[in-house]
Structures are given as structure tokens and as C-alpha cells.
């Protein structure tokens, strides 16, 4: 009889342990669900707020038509300038028209005055041809005014309202360009 009671007690204890485990699993599952819900809500909130606040250009960038421009506050050599732009999802400024050149030089006058700013233009060492960083040729009116006497690689920069050339290893400010976000509205 005593053995029977002891067996029942053990079975009950086993059942109790199983129920405790199930409860623990349920609590964990509930907590996981709550966390996921929280994450989901946060994600939705972020998506909504970023959609609401999405301007065509990031903070501290200037917009003109389909482009966003960033005028650097640091100096660097041409190659490092390019890498700094890439970190921001942009490339060095590529001037496609006189209108764009006028916008850039006008903006620079307002922001900083007469400094040197690297753009994405360089001179091929073999052919002597000027090419933008994407391989396209500048329009005739947008060729650097003076040929640099440097034996080293030569790159283009903007100063005041002119496009000039200099040794790529000199330190200058730089201008980055990226495409403006199109409004989906």
C-alpha cells in the first residue's frame, strides 16, 4: 500500500515538474513575443518617421535638382577625398553643365569664400586627357583653365568660379555628390 502511495506521489511530482517546465516555456515564449512585438513596433515607428522626415538630401548637404552636395570641412589629398565621399555613399563632384558650375560656385561663395575644393576630375598620365572619375569626358567649357606643371598625377579643383588643376597629392577641401532621393508621393 505504502509502495503504491509512493509511486502515485512520484507520478504527481513528475507531472508537477512537467507543468512547471511548460509554464516556464510559455513564459519564455510570451517574453519572446513581447520583445518581437516591441521590435516590430519600433521598426514600424522608425519606418514611418523616416518616411515622414525623408528629405531628398541628408542633413548638412545642399540640394540642386537631382543632386545632393556636401562641402567638406577638412583637407585631404585627392585620393583620400574620394574615399571620404565613398564612405557617405557619394563620389567627388562631377560637374555636368555650366548651370551646375554656377550653382556650385555660388553656394561656395555663401558658405566659405575663396578656397580650393577637389572635384572628381583627373588627367590621364599617358594621354594627357581630362576625364571625370566615371570615365566620361568633360564638356569643352568645363576643362581646367591652366595646365599644372607638376610631374606627378594632376587632378581638378574648383576655386572661386574657375576650374583649375594641381598635383593630386596637395591638400584641399573637397565636394561630394550623390543622387537626391526621389519623393515617392
Amino acid at each position: 500500500k505504502l509502495l503504491q502511495v509512493s509511486t502515485i506521489a512520484m507520478q504527481q511530482q513528475e507531472k508537477l515538474i512537467q507543468q512547471e517546465r511548460a509554464l516556464l516555456n510559455f513564459t519564455e515564449w510570451k517574453r519572446s513575443c513581447a520583445l518581437q512585438m516591441k521590435y516590430c513596433q519600433a521598426f514600424m515607428q522608425n519606418s514611418l518617421s523616416s518616411a515622414h522626415n525623408s528629405s531628398p538630401c541628408p542633413n548638412n548637404w545642399i540640394q540642386n535638382r537631382e543632386s545632393c552636395y556636401y562641402v567638406s570641412e577638412i583637407w585631404s589629398i585627392w585620393h583620400t577625398s574620394q574615399e571620404n565621399c565613398l564612405k557617405e555613399g557619394s563620389t567627388l563632384l562631377q560637374i555636368e553643365s555650366k548651370e551646375e558650375m554656377d550653382f556650385i560656385t555660388g553656394s561656395l561663395r555663401k558658405i566659405k569664400g575663396s578656397y580650393d575644393y577637389w572635384v572628381g576630375l583627373s588627367q590621364d598620365g599617358h594621354s594627357g586627357r581630362w576625364l571625370w572619375q566615371d570615365g566620361s569626358s568633360p564638356s569643352p567649357g568645363l576643362l581646367p583653365a591652366e595646365r599644372s606643371q607638376s610631374a606627378n598625377q594632376v587632378c581638378g579643383y574648383v576655386k572661386s568660379n574657375s576650374l583649375l588643376s594641381s598635383n593630386c597629392s596637395t591638400w584641399k577641401y573637397f565636394i561630394c555628390e550623390k543622387y537626391a532621393l526621389r519623393s515617392s508621393v
Epitope: 565613398l86 555613399g89 555628390e177 550623390k178
Partner: nanobody, 115 residues
Framework: QVQLQESGGGLVQAGGSLRLSCAAS????????MGWYRPALGEQRELVAA???????AYVDSVKGRFTISRDAAKNTVYLQMNSLKPEDTAVYSC?????????WGQGTQVTVSS
């Protein structure tokens, strides 16, 4: 963290073509641009070609008109199509992912152009 895996390197004759691939995995949302590098004289590495997430491209002068960088956003992969290869293009080509805070490098893939 971002992981990069390059492929497509090999031995090719001068004038031939190769296509390098660089597949990104991990925290890919933080990537703003990707580029291909190779060793350069007097410098550690030179940027051969790069492409931003917006599709803007940049090339070193010596490969303009011969190499084309492109991307497949769905596959998180960047390609470097190398045409009219020259012996001086021989190098280990490494892929780099640009993020605002950190740069991530792949292991590199060997390209050998024989004359």
C-alpha cells in the same frame, strides 16, 4: 560586421577578359559603397573602381574605358568586368566595403595577365 567573399580571379592572356565578383553578407545595410583595390607603386593600395549604393561610379585613370564596375543589389554582389587586360593589371584584387564608421576588406583574388 560585414563579410566579403571575392571570386573570379585567374590566369588570362593579354587582351583577354575576366569578371571578378564580391559577395557581401552580414550587416549589409550599413554599406554605402563598395570598391576594388590593388597594390600600387609607392602606395599601399590604389582604388581601381568603386560604386555607391546609389549607382555612382569612380575609376582610376589607368582602367577607364577597359574596366566596368556594376552591382546586383538583390544578390548583395559587386562585379568588376575587366576587358583588354594588360600584364600591368596583374595583382591581387581586394574588395572593400565602405561604411560611415568602418571599412571592411575581403581576402583578395589573384589576377595574372600573361603576355
Amino acid at each position: 560586421q560585414v563579410q566579403l567573399q571575392e571570386s573570379g580571379g585567374g590566369l588570362v592572356q593579354a587582351g583577354g577578359s575576366l569578371r571578378l565578383s564580391c559577395a557581401a553578407s552580414g550587416s549589409i545595410d550599413s554599406i554605402n559603397a563598395m570598391g576594388w583595390y590593388r597594390p600600387a607603386l609607392g602606395e599601399q593600395r590604389e582604388l581601381v573602381a568603386a560604386i555607391t549604393t546609389g549607382g555612382r561610379t569612380a575609376y582610376v585613370d589607368s582602367v577607364k574605358g577597359r574596366f566596368t564596375i556594376s552591382r546586383d543589389a538583390a544578390k548583395n554582389t559587386v562585379y568588376l568586368q575587366m576587358n583588354s587586360l594588360k600584364p600591368e593589371d596583374t595583382a591581387v584584387y581586394s574588395c572593400k566595403a565602405f561604411t560611415r564608421d568602418t571599412d571592411y576588406w575581403g581576402q583578395g583574388t589573384q589576377v595574372t595577365v600573361s603576355s
